[in-house]
């Protein structure tokens, strides 16, 4: 077995691979020159196609193996990886989808930025909706519970549909779903707050088709380098769609003079998104970049993959990880405004608020150092996962862990800050955020390291359902609720309040710390599982009959 | 059976303060919204000031002819809303009605389902 | 603001007549328009809520239509006990706003 790590590590950039790509072609060119119309040509034909003993497979991290060979013209023989389809027909090899590859994933990065921009055009005017409609704090809890709870049960359904049907035609199903149904909750009569409820969790069905499925064709257009670049360029969406839908929300309401109209912009720009996905997002199949083709289609019974993936421990502690991020992200974007604003109660910087919004002005400049930290957090991540890859090869969950545990540090700061100085709590916010959004997309990467191509999409569900459960689902109550606990044994006063809410934040530091913990338990069987992986890789592009899985 | 019985009004010269109290049974008054709504003599209704519940943060509103100068509150433990007015001109004489919302839990309407008797505000010097 | 116009400001019609009262918004403010009765030095009370909706206890020869800005009120066969004054309310926006009202008066 090659040392797959170090493939990793040898080829130092995109560029490399590109031109590792390149000899790989024109070695396939020239073979296809003696064979005549291509390596399956033959059999296309309905003749015997002869595979040439040096065929070659790229695997899960890009590196170059001698394939096993089959009996002549056996479906699945490598070099026959892609079973043709017709006389003469050939399945394109990634290398040469060229820009073409870069354009979907541009594409896809731009459908994600959708997906949070309609998910923060709704926050961007949650005053106003709950204004309009009447709605008590507890329906705005309402709307987003439903929310939650329907693209987490969601998830795994698509989860499953992604690793067997065309992900190029859900997606679009799905951008094409949750546009309509925006759209149409703009004109949801003041009465109908049940349909509101219901069109946010309709939204949540369609938006969770998206992230559970758009990963997992960027895992199969790219690999090594170029992927964890890509799956930056695509989580970066998240922080940006996010700053972006508070902007579209605002700022259309006050162009219109309405608020309707905010929840009008980004359905006519999904439609858009949609169409272009079904028209440049090529129909990759899953393995593409790994050189498997058409080979690749589940095979195996959703509970089997469930039990894989279960057994599968790099996925199974970096899914906690990402729930330990989840949990911290959920509780501070919805504590942290009223916190700073209880801080300056108690700097005597800010008067009791009595009437709502409280904090609009921390919440405003909270929104854009998360957006801008996202930015920051996933391009340092990329960058110095790209470094460490030269020296160890756990890099990935290694640069992740640190990343954590530096954050929980800062996190901590931040309550001790904030009782003297907003500006020194603001600067741990950022430094803490930016280490915290660091492993975005390292943890995609890791997923697509060790989860086979035709497992990716039900285990990015199956993350997405546990981060949101164990995650943001519960963490903003479950603060709430230990800040009240505290607040009904102490006297009433505003620096009670200020420090009930922070004693009840100190909560995640401490889950922070166990993320990092979890990373650290994802290096110590990262290099096995990957390896494992790649075998199970190298097995599905041979005849089914040996496929043990 | 609901009942809303405002008490406090009065004769008062502009200038002076006054405050209506409305005493509530019936209901769920805890979790109900409740409005003020005034009508000069002769003259249509007009709404005045709005409070909302505890799971709404005790948020107030208030027309633009008030705000600044009538401030409206709320004892949920004693079922009664307030109305204290400030600085009272003459166009304040009015019959106030003391108002409550139809309560649906998770949200509220801003249709007023049951009214007061109302209590004669008259300002003149 | 949003700005109501009631019309006619009176009515005259006979006993068992049907009438429709009109209410005209300033913009576009959907079905949220409630319609109020108010008798002679008594209070309101609501007789449709979002522009078509009834009301348990009131009467069912009075309904409600509309959406957008027009808005009508009619009553089936006026009885001698609906001779008031009907005022709309809008609760698409504050603050809430009332119509100027429409006396309805025995001919």
């Known amino acids: 077995m090659m040392c797959l790590e170090c493939a990793s590590a040898a080829a130092g950039g995109a560029e490399e691979e590109e031109a590792d790509a390149e000899r790989r072609r024109r070695r396939r060119g020239a073979q296809r020159g003696a064979g005549g119309s291509g390596c399956c040509g033959a059999r296309g034909a309905g003749g015997a196609g002869v595979s040439a003993a040096g065929d070659e497979v790229q695997t899960l991290s890009g590196s170059v193996r001698r394939a096993p060979t089959g009996p002549p013209g056996t479906p699945g023989t490598p070099g026959c990886a892609a079973t043709a389809k017709g006389p003469g027909a050939q399945q394109p090899k990634p290398a040469s989808l060229g820009r073409g590859r870069g354009a979907a994933a541009a594409i896809l990065s731009l459908g994600n930025v959708l997906n949070y921009l309609d998910r923060y055009t709704v926050a961007g005017v949650l005053l106003d909706i709950q204004q309009h409609f009447g709605v008590k704090d507890r329906g705005a809890g309402l709307l987003q519970s439903v929310f939650i709870c329907s693209f987490m049960v969601a998830a795994p359904i698509f989860g499953y549909l992604g690793d067997r049907f065309n992900r190029k035609v859900i997606l679009s199903c799905g951008i094409f779903f949750w546009s309509a149904v925006t759209f149409s909750s703009s004109f949801i009569p003041q009465q109908y707050f049940w349909l509101l409820v219901l069109s946010r969790g309709l939204v949540g069905i369609g938006e969770a088709s998206y992230s559970t499925i758009a990963p997992t064709i960027i895992g199969d257009l790219f690999t090594k380098n170029t992927r964890t670049l890509m799956l930056s360029v695509f989580y970066f969406a998240i922080p940006l769609g996010s700053g972006l839908g508070y902007i579209t929300g605002s700022s259309v309401k006050q162009a219109a003079g309405d608020w309707h109209w905010a929840l009008r912009v980004s359905p006519v720009l999904g439609m858009i998104t949609g169409t272009l996905i079904l028209i440049l997002v090529p129909a990759t199949k899953r393995g593409h970049a790994d050189q498997l083709g058409d080979q690749l289609k589940a095979r195996t019974s959703w509970l089997r993959d469930m039990k894989a993936l279960i057994r599968n421990r790099s996925y199974v502690f970096s899914s906690l990880a990402t729930s330990a991020v989840s949990f911290a992200t959920g509780a501070l974007g919805m504590w942290i405004p009223l916190y700073l604003h209880r801080a300056q109660v108690v700097q005597k910087t800010a008067e009791t608020c009595n009437s709502p919004p409280c904090g609009a002005k921390d919440s405003l400049i909270f929104g854009a150092i998360t957006c801008f930290t996202g930015f920051l957090g996933v391009v340092t991540g990329a960058g110095a996962t790209r470094w460490c890859r030269l020296k160890t090869q756990r890099a990935d969950p290694l640069v992740c862990a640190v990343g954590m545990l530096g954050s929980a540090i800062f996190i901590c700061l931040i309550f001790v800050a904030a009782k003297s100085s907003i500006v020194g709590a603001y600067i741990c916010i950022f430094v803490g955020e930016t280490l915290l959004f660091s492993n975005w997309a390292i943890t995609a990467d890791i997923l697509m390291y060790v989860v086979i191509p035709t497992r990716r999409a039900t285990a990015v569900a199956l993350q997405s359902f546990t981060s949101h459960l164990l995650g943001d689902a519960g963490s903003p109550y479950l603060i709430g609720f230990i800040s009240d606990l505290i607040r009904q044994s102490t006297k009433d006063s505003p620096l009670w309040e200020f420090l009930s809410l922070g004693y009840a934040l100190m909560l995640c530091p401490f889950v922070v710390v166990l993320g990092g913990m979890f990373f650290l338990a994802t290096a110590l069987f990262f290099v096995s599982d990957r390896a494992r992986a790649e075998q199970q890789v190298n097995q599905l592009a041979m005849p089914p009959a040996s496929v043990k899985v | 059976e609901v009942q809303l019985v405002e008490t406090g009004g009065g004769l008062v010269q502009p200038g002076s303060s006054l405050k209506l109290s409305c005493a509530t049974s019936?209901?769920?008054?805890?979790?109900?919204?409740m409005s003020w709504v005034r009508q000069a003599p002769g003259k249509g209704l007009e709404w005045v000031a709005l409070?909302?519940?505890?799971?709404?943060?005790?948020?107030?509103n208030y027309a633009e002819s008030v705000k600044g100068r009538f401030t409206i509150s709320r004892d949920d433990s004693k079922r009664r809303v307030y109305l204290q007015m400030f600085t009272l001109r003459d166009q304040d004489t009015a019959t106030y009605y003391c108002t409550s919302h139809e309560d649906f839990y998770y949200y509220s309407s801003y249709y007023f389902d049951y009214w007061g008797h109302g209590v004669m505000v008259t300002v003149s010097s | 603001d949003i700005v109501l116009t009631q019309s006619p400001a009176t009515l005259s019609v006979t006993p068992g007549e049907s009438v429709s009262l009109s209410c005209r918004a300033s913009q576009g403010i959907s079905t949220s328009i409630h319609w109020y009765q108010q008798k002679s030095n008594g209070s309101p009370r609501l007789l449709i809520k979002y522009a078509s909706q009834s009301i348990s206890g009131i009467p069912s020869r009075f309904s409600g239509s509309g959406s957008g800005t027009d808005f009508t009120l009619r009553i089936n066969r006026v009885e001698s006990e609906d001779f008031s004054v009907y005022y709309c309310q809008q609760t698409y926006s504050l603050p809430l706003t009332f119509g100027s009202g429409t006396r309805l008066e025995i001919k």
């Open positions: 409070i909302k519940d505890k799971n709404s943060n005790y948020e107030a």
């Open positions: 019936g209901f769920t008054f805890s979790d109900t919204w």
